[in-house]
Interface confidence: medium
Amino acid sequence: AQGKEVVLLDFAAAGGELGWLTHPYGKGWDLMQNIMNDMPIYMYSVCNVMSGDQDNWLRTNWVYRGEAERIFIELKFTVRDCNSFPGGASSCKETFNLYYAESDLDYGTNFQKRLFTKIDTIAPDEITVSSDFEARHVKLNVEERSVGPLTRKGFYLAFQDIGACVALLSVRVYYKKCPELLQGLAHFPETIAGSDAPSLATVAGTCVDHAVVPPGGEEPRMHCAVDGEWLVPIGQCLCQAGYEKVEDACQACSPGFFKFEASESPCLECPEHTLPSPEGATSCECEEGFFRAPQDPASMPCTRPPSAPHYLTAVGMGAKVELRWTPPQDSGGREDIVYSVTCEQCWPESGECGPCEASVRYSEPPHGLTRTSVTVSDLEPHMNYTFTVEARNGVSGLVTSRSFRTASVSINQTEPPKVRLEGRSTTSLSVSWSIPPPQQSRVWKYEVTYRKKGDSNSYNVRRTEGFSVTLDDLAPDTTYLVQVQALTQEGQGAGSKVHEFQTLSPEGSGNLAV
């Protein structure tokens, strides 16, 4: 921020009323009036360029220092070119000297040169040459000097002429302050600039109303430089929850808006399915029947548990069931839907039912499913199963009601046997099979059906109680179609896939395991 100047003395603004002291009295410096831009201006002028040694002094009135530590002196002046006078005026000079003296009281007209300390010799950047003078072009020079630290109650400035043709049009004395400042929602008070150029005064800021230092953040501080400029901002304040930054202040969130933490972000509109918030809200309450999960951000709409899975099918395949369903029609406004599958089995004879999680096998863990299908295997034949698929989301735990759909299926057949070729020769095939152990007790016999591939007119059947059979009297180098089916007291079980097995050719005779 730009430095603030506090003016202690302004000759140009005084309209010739200051009455400065001249020494020697009545000679040298003289107050005169001129017209510039159609306005009267006053100036202190001296032009004794032909008179040899000059020592003309002009002293200001006593200036009260106040709180100033370092003062700045701005001079606006014009100096005529010595060559513009006849003969070049051999004693003519083109500079003058600036002095100051500190004192605790006003000495009035008692002027003593020895009390004054020289600040500098003031030289013009541009001198007024004859043509400029004749054309009324005033070549105005601006020079600034500073003095400090000052310690007494007040001071004088003095101007010593040593034979120049000079006019002082403006003498302005001021000190600098770092102005009152609002930055980063922190207020910094007006601060007097220090007197030593390298030093920076550290100034603590205060958070504006409804602003706070963020957790772990630095307290706001700035540095007031000697020229009255604020430098090196450190830390900041943020509008607290329920308030947002509007220009340099924190303003309460409007009704229907909220802000849940101290941050730089503005208030946000209350999300869907929330009640209208009052002014200065830090969150928006959910409508009845809608909830917020603990991990949900306040900016997220309130949500509700999902409806039940929309459509559930249970397709039996022997001792397996594939469950398929479609997502709920109402997701509750959330995307974190998961499904849980539970199983209940009932014995048709007794009507007795119980959970069956321990006896069945799922293609993937039945809780927290994200896909919409699962296969359940190791089901027992001639048993009624009821499967429940429940849809849940992040807020389901906040209500007691459940959203589920059920499907029932009766297992009337055993699972198809898994068949493999154990060995073969030119005239025989050795075949084995297996079914899940829970179903083995219900099987009476196994029926093996086989025929030559391409011959649909005749087939052979073999029955056995074991889990393997050797089929003899087969033709060499011939492909046979083989199927195994379990036989139970209630009838036929599910048949296996039809397998193609080939006997060996005569050249490659010998028993070869596959």
Epitope: N34, P40, M43, S45, F133
Partner: antibody, heavy 128, light 107 residues
């Protein structure tokens, strides 16, 4: 020694024209502001016009504005006053006058000029 | 325009007398005032500029004073060569104006 010598005056009828000249010597003409000042018979002095050292700016009294033209030729050290549409009230002795700021011991020039050097004058009579 | 009024219009004095002529401006002209002396049939001569500065070659018995609107020309001891008409002129404004003149005659 500074010398200013006017010429060109005489009798002229109302509405007529006349051109006055002022020959300068004894000083650096191109450094001087030059002016014409007139004095009606038995009356006081009246400023007529001025011209800057290099030919500008020029200023005129309201009574002659639009009728008189001041000019100078620094190569000939001569000042001129072209007078058109002359009136009876223009009858006067016309003086050429000069001002050199080098002799003016002030830091800032006055808004206008005074006249350090004068010619002996030339009489202009406007009469029918 | 700025009006300049001189007083008196004429005065009679003796050699050796102290004579003061005044000039009043219709508005403040600071110290931008000159005084001239004119003898019959002659061109005016500059005496004083900037209200109080004596022009080169002018005898020191002539002095000027004043600022703002009130000015005066003083001849401390009137000499035979000083009987003439005296004019003031303001040069604050570009329409430089003269007073109507003060005639100093021998008593």
């Amino acid at each position: 020694e500074v010398q200013l010598l006017e010429s060109g005056g005489g009798l002229v009828q109302p509405g007529g024209s006349l051109r006055l000249s002022c020959a300068a010597s004894g000083f650096t003409f191109s450094h001087y502001m030059m002016a014409w000042v007139r004095q009606a018979p038995g009356k006081g002095l009246e400023w007529v016009s001025r011209i800057g050292p290099s030919g500008g700016p020029t200023h005129y009294a309201d009574s002659v504005k639009g009728r008189f033209t001041i000019s100078r030729d620094n190569s000939k050290n001569t000042l001129y006053l072209q007078m058109n549409s002359l009136r009876a009230e223009d009858t006067a002795v016309y003086y050429c006058a000069g001002y050199d700021s080098g002799y003016d011991y002030v830091a800032v020039a006055g808004p206008a000029e005074y006249f350090q050097h004068w010619g002996q004058g030339t009489l202009v009579t406007v009469s029918s | 325009d700025i009006q300049m009024t001189q007083s008196p219009s004429s005065l009679s004095a003796s050699v050796g007398d102290r004579v003061t002529i005044t000039c009043r401006a219709s508005q403040s002209i600071s110290t931008w005032l000159a005084w001239y002396q004119q003898k019959p049939g002659k061109a005016p001569k500059l005496l004083i500029y900037k209200a109080s500065n004596l022009h080169t070659g002018v005898p020191s018995r002539f002095s000027g004073s004043g600022s703002g609107t009130e000015f005066s020309l003083t001849i401390s001891s009137l000499q035979p060569d000083d009987f003439a008409t005296y004019y003031c002129q303001q040069y604050q404004s570009y329409s430089r104006t003269f007073g109507q003149g003060t005639k100093v005659e021998i008593k």
